[in-house]
Interface confidence: medium
């Protein structure tokens, strides 16, 4: 999906007002220095691409974040403010047929959400030069 035509300011507002708090809640009890940020993004569409991938695609060691509150809110914000996003998601979901594992907050999931926090912070500061 091409995130170029999303309403970035509305998505930023959604992040600042609610998604950021849910990410912090998920990471509660974890030191902010515990994980190194290894995923980066260069502009807002690229950041949303990476955010979508890390939030909704199952990875080794972290089967599914899809029903976490920050993920549900992320999906809602993208669905509302990115034209045509839902149709793309329907096709992707049917192609993946992913299975949800027992809900366990693994260290791998914590690392993944830490990466998400970095991507969202980067999304909110699009004019900063890439580190």
């Amino acid at each position: 999906y091409d995130f170029t035509n999303c309403d970035f300011e509305k998505i930023k507002a959604a992040y600042l007002s609610t998604i950021s708090k849910d990410l912090i809640t998920y990471m509660s009890g974890t030191k902010s220095t515990e994980f190194n940020n290894t995923v980066s993004c260069s502009n807002r569409p690229h950041c949303l691409t990476e955010i979508q991938s890390l939030t909704f695609n199952p990875t080794a060691g972290c089967a599914s974040l899809a029903k976490e509150m920050f993920a549900m809110k992320t999906k809602a914000a993208l669905a509302i403010w990115c034209p045509g996003y839902s149709e793309t998601q329907i096709n992707a979901t049917q192609a993946m047929k992913k299975r949800r594992k027992r809900k366990v907050t693994t260290n791998k999931c914590l690392e993944q959400v830490s990466q998400l926090q970095g991507l969202w912070r980067r999304f909110n500061r699009p004019l900063l030069k890439q580190q």
Partner: antibody, heavy 123, light 106 residues
Amino acid sequence: QVQLVESGGGVVQPGRSLRLSCAASGFTFSSYGMHWVRQAPGKGLEWVAVKWYEGSNKYYGDSVKGRFTISRDNSKNTLYLQMNSLRGEDTAVYYCARGAHDYGDFYYGMDVWGQGTTVTVSS
Amino acid sequence: SYELTQPASVSVSPGQIASITCSGDNLGDKYICWYQQKPGQSPVRVIYQDNKRPSGIPERFSGSNSGNTATLTISGTQAMDEADYYCQAWDSSTVVFGGGTKLTVL
């Protein structure tokens, strides 16, 4: 109290158009996503469309895509459904329903429903 | 398109437990709502986010959702619970309803 009142239903010939209205009161209309849901005689609920906030996306059920248009006028606290190229299978009671207030309750369903307005498509 | 499947009818004796199922591919990945509709009336939401009960809905209504099946459970079913029940989920940004289950209290 929170209330939704639909109007605009009636008998219409196939191929013609009709516009339904839903007047909202008792809550901040502009802050909520709004849905249309229909129910054919003796059948189950069928989702028709949703319109979120000002400037946001609209989504439609497959059976009405390209024929129906959902819109809203926040200054009038009113939701609309413009129905074009009507068919016999569009005959139903049409309900207006309130959806999400924010991103957190996006998936919480529809908590307030109107009483419905009946649309009959017949020659 | 995504489909939710419900039994057409369920019968239960007063005071017994009624279980109404709703099945769909990987349904546990989605949040489910349940609606009650009595004849001639508009639907009423009785469960949201799988298992949460709106204010004003009796405690005898509960919900669960895992794997491919969501279940609405009514413990101590009363005559007033006789109605049609619909499950509902989001498939991305489109709403999907189950076909509905007629609950008969014998």
